[in-house]
């Protein structure tokens, strides 16, 4: 492998390792981590793309774990708080074996090649240009870390346009009890928009490393229902909306609506009386055709907590429930920025909303 580009490689660095990425991450930068997984001692290793050396702000945490059959966790840490995990349940690494791990930085995501095959796509939750450090720790021996710069560095677009494709996989939530809202999680990469966390906890400390709209505060331990809030900037590819809450023990139905003016662009309607999750669009008070298919059993359970992650991509919304990708809903209203209102109602208690 030729070590091209402006930065010299780190050769046989000792682990744990932290090193500067000269000039920070750039669109098109390719970083190769070559090494061997240790056959003894420890069940995990991690490669982190972070801001500074403290480990409190990690834009991309890539964490293979030789546990429970083997899986890889991807995550982001902001101000010391981890976001929801994305898990890949195939393990491309083998204990005692060498590996070649290549990270390709692109405007919308990191693409990770392991031993010559695309392994995972991780969409930026924080602007990647903040990253100036790579760190490696855990049960691994490194041969080198190399850097290959692109020939030209395009300006990062205001909006990410590459669709999200990797199924979301958070860790499963413990069932049967209320969950604390997750810590601060992803700020969106688009610089002209803001992420707003609507919280019912006591006032938090500084939530963002850059100025942001302060979170909406509620004096009660639960959200008012129905809950309605603005989605600043509307939808666009890579925009995420996260909700968590608890289904009431006697629940019949609840709904999560993404609205555009008088239209409901996306109506997510779990129905316990029908054991179904109905999806639809309402235009001018007229409902379209329902979508009900699910890849597995009804994920919402009366009396139990849940999380819903809605991720907008160019062609569709991807919806994950309790960390597992559930379905895609292809846009019927395609003017995404006009879809700028979230409405939640029905037989649930909300504990956390982030738009």
């Amino acid at each position: 492998m030729a070590f091209s580009g402006s930065q010299a490689p780190y050769l046989s660095p000792a682990v744990p390792f932290s090193g500067t990425i000269q000039g920070g991450l750039q669109d098109g930068l390719q970083i190769t981590v070559n090494g061997t997984v240790l056959s003894s001692s420890g069940t995990r290793f991690a490669v982190n793309f972070q801001t500074g050396f403290s480990g409190n702000d990690i834009a991309f945490h890539f964490n293979p774990r030789f546990e429970d059959g083997g899986y890889v966790v991807c995550n982001t840490r902001q101000n010391g708080s981890w976001g929801p995990e994305e898990r890949k349940t195939h393990m491309p690494f083998q204990k005692g074996m060498p590996f070649d791990l290549c990270f390709l930085v692109q405007s919308s995501d990191f693409k990770v090649m392991v031993n010559g095959i695309l392994f995972v796509q991780y969409f930026h939750r924080v602007p990647f240009h903040r990253v100036d450090t790579i760190s490696v720790n855990g049960s691994v021996q490194l041969s080198y870390i190399s850097f290959q710069n692109p020939r030209t560095v395009p300006v990062q677009p205001a909006f990410s346009t590459v669709p999200f494709s990797q199924p979301v996989c958070f860790p499963p939530r413990p069932r049967g009890r209320r969950q604390k809202p997750p810590g601060v999680w992803p700020a969106n990469p688009a610089p002209i928009t803001q992420t707003v966390i609507h919280t019912v906890q006591s006032a938090p400390g500084q939530m963002f490393s850059t100025p942001a709209i302060p979170p909406m505060m509620y004096p009660h331990p639960a959200y008012p229902m129905p809950f309605i809030t603005t989605i600043l900037g509307g939808l666009y590819p890579s925009k995420s909306i996260l909700l968590s809450g608890t289904v009431l023990p006697s629940a019949q139905r609840f709904h999560i609506n993404l609205c555009s003016g008088n239209h409901i662009a996306f109506h997510l309607n779990p129905r316990f009386d029908e054991n179904a999750v109905v999806r639809n669009t309402q235009i001018d008070n007229s409902w379209g055709s329902e979508e009900r298919s699910l890849p597995r059993k009804m994920p919402f359970v009366r009396g139990q907590s849940f999380s819903v992650w809605i991720l907008c991509e160019a062609h569709c919304l991807k919806v994950a429930v309790d960390g597992q990708h559930l379905f895609e809903y292809y846009h019927r209203l395609r003017n995404l920025p006009t879809i700028n209102r979230l409405e939640v109602g029905g037989d649930i208690q909300l504990t956390h909303v982030q738009t």
Partner: antibody, heavy 126, light 109 residues
Framework: EVQLVESGGGLVQPGGSLRLSCAAS????????IHWVRQAPGKGLEWVAY????????SYADSVKGRFTISADTSKNTAYLQMNSLRAEDTAVYYC???????????????????WGQGTLVTVSS | DIQMTQSPSSLSASVGDRVTITCRAS??????VAWYQQKPGKAPKLLIY???SLYSGVPSRFSGSRSGTDFTLTISSLQPEDFATYYC???????????FGQGTKVEIK
């Protein structure tokens, strides 16, 4: 000019062995992954195995796991497919192909098999 | 394993026709999908990589697109040399990192 040339095919009895070679020129096998793909007579393409010589990583289709072994000799710029315990259903034309080279001009991975050999026929029959 | 369901299995078309072939992945494969053309007795040739990028030297009448887990190969105006079998292929790491579609034979009407 990039080129891949397979050799080693032929007629073999069930339970027998063959070793296929894939000689590369115009690029180094250690900079790409090398795949074997087969095609039974009148059928579609079936992926068999791959090796990433740079790290030594190998992977196999379930249908050949435990019977076939892929390897590479970077000094000879050649990849190999050792086929043991051959069965009638292994009868096919075997191709080697190069996969996933990085295009620095476009900052893109070429997620596809951009160069293929001409193929070598393996016939398993008694 | 990730399955690639290709349709149709065969089609008849005339020179100048617009031809569309579709592959549906059984789960997300990102954009790591390629399309190949194969003629009898010959090795496959790469047409499209990364779902929509035209490979060097391939005529511009070939194009690829993606919508979720659906991938499409389009030949805008079929030429005599385009009568062949076409395969899609995914390469997104799974228990089997590479899988091909069943193939689509494009024949002369």
């Amino acid at each position: 000019e990039v080129q891949l040339v397979e050799s080693g095919g032929g007629l073999v009895q069930p339970g027998g062995s063959l070793r296929l070679s894939c000689a590369a020129s115009g690029f180094t096998v250690s900079s790409s992954s090398i795949h074997w793909v087969r095609q039974a007579p009148g059928k579609g393409l079936e992926w068999v195995a791959y090796i990433y010589p740079y790290s030594g990583y190998t992977s196999y289709a379930d249908s050949v796991k435990g019977r076939f072994t892929i390897s590479a000799d970077t000094s000879k710029n050649t990849a190999y497919l050792q086929m043991n315990s051959l069965r009638a259903e292994d009868t096919a034309v075997y191709y080697c192909a190069r996969y996933s080279t990085y295009s620095s001009s476009s900052s893109k991975w070429v997620w596809g098999m951009d160069y293929w050999g001409q193929g070598t026929l393996v016939t398993v029959s008694s | 394993d990730i399955q690639m369901t290709q349709s149709p299995s065969s089609l008849s078309a005339s020179v100048g026709d617009r031809v569309t072939i579709t592959c549906r992945a059984s789960q997300s494969v990102s954009s790591a999908v390629a399309w190949y053309q194969q003629k009898p007795g010959k090795a496959p040739k790469l047409l499209i990589y990364s779902a929509s990028s035209l490979y060097s030297g391939v005529p511009s009448r070939f194009s690829g697109s993606r919508s979720g887990t659906d991938f499409t190969l389009t030949i805008s105006s079929l030429q005599p040399e385009d009568f062949a079998t076409y395969y899609c292929q995914q390469s997104y790491y799974d228990s089997n990192p590479i899988t091909f579609g069943q193939g689509t034979k494009v024949e002369i009407k």
